[in-house]
Interface confidence: medium
């Protein structure tokens, strides 16, 4: 099956916008928007720090770490209020992602 221009293959995602701003207190705030064509039972999420189609149950129950959102070698830690997760690099640097 041929894809029309701008059409995504089933189960794939692409980054639409990536804004970086406001480097305050050595923190860079990045906002990313993605477009996904997910299969039934899937929903847009993050895997290995990239937009991906993930099991919808993960999103419903806010078990964010089950998406494997961090890079290989990083540790995933759920924020207690379930608003997102942190990825801890081997050197100890922590990157926090919140879902909106």
């Amino acid at each position: 099956q041929f894809l029309k221009e701008g059409q995504l293959a089933a189960g794939t995602c692409e980054i639409v916008t990536l804004d970086r701003c406001c480097n305050k207190n050595r923190r860079t705030i990045a906002r990313q928007t993605a477009r996904c064509a997910c299969r039934k039972g899937q929903i847009a999420g993050t895997t290995r720090a990239r937009p991906a189609c993930v099991d919808a149950r993960i999103i419903k129950t806010k078990q964010w770490c089950d998406m494997l959102p961090c890079l290989e070698g990083e540790g995933c830690d759920l924020l207690i209020n379930r608003s997102g997760w942190t990825c801890t690099q081997p050197g100890g640097r922590i990157k926090t992602t919140t879902v909106s």
């Epitope: 806010k62 078990q63 089950d66 830690d77 924020l79 207690i80 379930r82």
Partner: antibody
Framework: AVTLDESGGGLQTPGGALSLVCKAS????????MGWVRQAPGKGLEWVGV????????SYGSAVKGRATISRDNGQSTVRLQLNNLRAEDTGTYFC???????????????WGHGTEVIVSS | ALTQPSSVSANPGETVKITCSGG??????YGWYQQKSPSSAPLTVI????KRPSDIPSRFSGSKSGSTHTLTITGVQAEDEAVYFC??????????????FGAGTTLTVL
């Protein structure tokens, strides 16, 4: 085997502070969120609070919010509960609890400590 | 808050069902905790709806139907006599997600 060993309980005075420590062994401590649950004499279980794996995030039950601080030392495999401005209703047994997955909730505790008894009385 | 019966009783070998309903976070499931005496530590018999720790006998199982969760003990034994607490999470704008437990169900083996 997973073991959680609490210490620091005993007789405390109202208005004072207590510090409880839970020493963990038998699992990779830094890979699990941890929490504290307490039980007043003759009563049910009450959520005290939790801490995430890195120690950067905590949450507390309404009865202790503003008075409790939970911290952890992944190098020493310990989690600490500090409770200030003690009241008689803080009397009870305090249990250390381990989450079963990448998070801890009252539905995902898979291991408990033996508990340490705290009595708040003048 | 979570609602569970205050007591249930059964003869050895019978099947016992203890229900738990309520809570604000059914997606995260329910846990069941056994306490044999007021001075002893709880023991997890079921966590995350239906997961059973490796040292818990297979006669203990958990199931969920809607917002009600059921702990089933198939072929109850004398040593199962205890208080059983269910656990879940509730959400409040003040405290966020906070763990909640039922008041406990006393199981008597006749």
């Amino acid at each position: 085997a997973v073991t959680l060993d609490e210490s620091g309980g005993g007789l405390q005075t109202p208005g004072g502070a207590l510090s409880l420590v839970c020493k963990a062994s038998g699992f990779t401590f830094s890979s699990y969120q941890m929490g504290w649950v307490r039980q007043a004499p003759g009563k049910g279980l009450e959520w005290v609070g939790v801490i995430n794996k890195s120690g950067s995030d905590t949450s507390y039950g309404s009865a202790v919010k503003g008075r409790a601080t939970i911290s952890r030392d992944n190098g020493q495999s310990t989690v600490r509960l500090q409770l200030n401005n003690l009241r008689a209703e803080d009397t009870g047994t305090y249990f250390c609890a381990k989450g079963s997955a990448s998070y801890i909730t009252a539905a995902t505790i898979d291991a408990w400590g033996h508990g340490t008894e705290v009595i708040v009385s003048s | 808050a979570l609602t569970q019966p205050s007591s249930v009783s059964a003869n050895p070998g019978e099947t016992v069902k203890i229900t738990c309903s309520g809570g604000g976070s059914s997606g995260y499931g329910y846990g069941w905790y056994q306490q044999k005496s007021p001075s002893s530590a709880p023991l997890t018999v079921i966590y995350w709806n239906d997961k059973r720790p490796s040292d818990i006998p297979s006669r203990f199982s958990g199931s969920k139907s809607g917002s009600t969760h059921t702990l089933t003990i198939t072929g109850v034994q004398a040593e199962d006599e205890a208080v059983y607490f269910c656990g879940n999470d509730d959400y409040s704008s003040d405290s966020g997600y906070v763990g909640v437990f039922g008041a406990g169900t006393t199981l008597t083996v006749l």
